[in-house]
């Protein structure tokens, strides 16, 4: 058997500082939750205790403080790329902008792949957005591969700006040939990351064969397992068990949104990548999780320029 | 177990080429990023190059930019510096080294053996 | 590019003794830092990776701290085998670098 964690953001909305319970500007740092330097430490402190650990985004980092008005997404890579992301899908959110505002400071400045099965550049942006973000990635982890499929909200035409020239596909019709090529290619371990809502990925896990875990966002659903450690009311259980119309049990998850949780889900794998067993929790981003110096300072530094903003 | 063994060292003469090879062994060689590291006779460890694990990217300091290429072939779990217009200030005990499974830097976890470099007319 | 300096570049210490090296960044690296142990005529070897991560098999008496532009190794009862050269290296962008690297000598 081998053994993956995954480690899960969604619907960060420009939460870069931490910020107060409900998620809005921090006012007792004391009582403070979230922000990318404690997801930092957090993050970090499961990296070292644990060997095959892949950190995941599932979307709309763009849009929801200051940062984002004044940093337009150079903000989301600069610090996504600190903190060594390994895969984001595309939201709704990050076609705010436009186009360009997602090619420019985001596409073309992460270090990490970007995903979306279902969107699909015609005319004079094909070429432009060519290889800038792709269907899925194949993850090298440790001595196994993993393959990461995205998938983004096909209504992102109606909530945001994404012009005429992307076209939002159905998500199961665009991801289910995305998955077969990855078998074809002996991947035997696929993770569906996206952000079509929670619904969305129940229905994914449900009819896309080959998916072994679907990791989702945009409906900011809050799952767990127990005592809630918070004010968010889960919707179900952590990990969400679906079983899928060809008979297998496939963990969906979220971590609710503002960066307030870090999903953590482990999953074990058998030799020929069928899931033998999962298990986890969001972890609350609170106080007790301090938050680290030096994504701090970065963060401080960058503070400079909103200040100015703001008088 | 994992092992790394360089070979392909020796004398060579200024402006002359020279090519290492990286044999390695108890590992998804195609998994991780592969490094060079050498080591001038009595001095410390320099970084010379780095090969992202599915080839896409190379990374070389200044000092070798443009004289040394990295390269690897998955097929056969080697990994090679072909090192051109040689310096005596190349002269070094090469190392391979293993680094990490992604495209961010990363540090090694696994050396070589090392193989000698002398540069001497 | 980033320069690591390291200090002292020698020290002079007994068996049973704590013994700390200090490694300092010419910017911000984040806990991208590792630390490596070369004896004499031999391939150095991983101690230390994420500034505090202790490489598996290495004894639990070696141990690294810092974030940002500072970082220690700390052997905290040096013992024979531990008489040799350390070095730093900073992983947070390319080229990577290494400190100049501190020998450990028998006193």
């Known amino acids: 058997a081998w053994e993956l964690t995954i480690l899960h953001t969604n619907d960060v909305h420009s939460r870069l500082e931490q910020t107060s319970e409900d998620s809005s500007k921090c006012v007792n740092a004391s009582r403070c939750m979230g922000g990318v330097a404690r997801l930092f430490t957090k993050v970090q402190q499961i990296r070292r205790a644990e060997p095959n650990v892949l950190l995941l985004d599932a979307g709309d980092q763009y849009q929801g403080t200051i940062w984002f008005t004044v940093y337009k997404g150079a903000e989301v890579a600069h610090f996504m790329n600190a903190l060594r992301y390994d895969a984001m899908a595309l939201g709704n959110h990050e076609f705010d902008n436009g186009v360009e505002g997602l090619i420019e400071p985001l596409l073309k400045e992460a270090k990490f792949p970007i995903l979306s099965a279902n969107i699909k550049a015609k005319g004079p942006l094909a070429s432009q957005i060519s290889g800038l973000y792709l269907p899925y990635k194949v993850l090298p982890v440790g001595d196994e591969v993993v393959g990461i499929v995205g998938y983004t909200s096909k209504e992102t035409p109606f909530l945001s700006n994404p012009g005429t020239n992307l076209v939002f596909e159905d998500e199961i019709t665009a991801l289910q040939p995305e998955v077969d090529k990855l078998k074809t290619l002996n991947v035997n371990k696929i993770i569906a990351l996206g952000h079509s809502g929670f619904e969305m990925d129940k229905l994914i896990a449900q009819k896309v064969r080959g998916v072994d875990v679907v990791v989702g966002g945009h409906s900011n659903t809050f799952l767990y397992t127990g005592n809630p450690p918070s004010k968010e009311v889960p919707a179900g259980k952590y990990p969400f068990i679906v079983t899928s119309d060809d008979g297998r049990k496939v963990p969906v998850v979220q971590a609710y949104a503002f960066g307030k949780y870090l999903g953590y889900l482990k999953i074990e794998f058998d030799e020929r990548g069928n899931v033998i067993s999962s298990h986890g929790n969001p972890i609350l981003l609170n106080s007790s999780i301090p938050e680290d110096p030096s994504i701090k300072a970065d963060i401080n530094k960058w503070r400079i320029k909103l200040d100015n903003y703001s008088t | 177990q994992v092992q790394l063994v360089e070979s392909g060292g020796g004398v060579v003469q200024p402006g002359r080429s020279l090519r290492l090879s990286c044999a390695t062994s108890?590992?998804?060689?195609?998994?991780?990023?592969m490094h060079w590291v050498r080591q001038a006779p009595g001095k410390g460890l320099e970084w010379v190059a780095v090969?992202?694990?599915?080839?896409?990217?190379?990374y070389y300091p200044d000092s070798v930019k443009g004289r040394f290429t990295i390269s690897r072939d998955n097929s056969k779990n080697t990994l090679y510096l072909q090192m051109n217009s040689l310096r005596a200030e190349d002269t070094a005990v090469y190392y391979c080294?293993?680094?990490?499974?992604?495209?961010?830097?990363?540090?090694?976890?696994?050396w070589g053996q090392g193989t000698m470099v002398t540069v001497s007319s | 590019d980033i320069q690591m300096t390291q200090s002292p570049s020698s020290l002079s210490a007994s068996v049973g003794d704590r013994v700390t090296i200090t490694c300092r960044a010419s910017?911000?690296?984040?806990?991208?830092l590792a630390w490596y142990q070369q004896k004499p005529e031999k391939a150095p070897k991983s101690l230390i990776y994420?500034?505090?991560s202790l490489q598996s098999g290495v004894p639990s008496r070696f141990s690294g701290s810092g974030s940002g532009t500072d970082f220690t190794l700390t052997i905290s009862s040096l013992q024979p085998e531990d008489f040799a050269t350390y070095y730093c290296?900073?992983?947070?962008?390319?080229?990577?670098?290494f400190g100049g690297g501190t020998k450990v000598e028998i006193k």
């Open positions: 080294a293993r680094g990490g499974s992604s495209w961010y830097p990363d540090s090694f976890d696994i």
């Open positions: 108890g590992f998804t060689f195609s998994n991780y990023g």
């Open positions: 090969i992202l694990y599915d080839g896409s990217n190379k």
């Open positions: 910017q911000g690296i984040s806990s991208w």
């Open positions: 994420a500034a505090s």
């Open positions: 290296q900073q992983y947070n962008s390319y080229p990577l670098t």
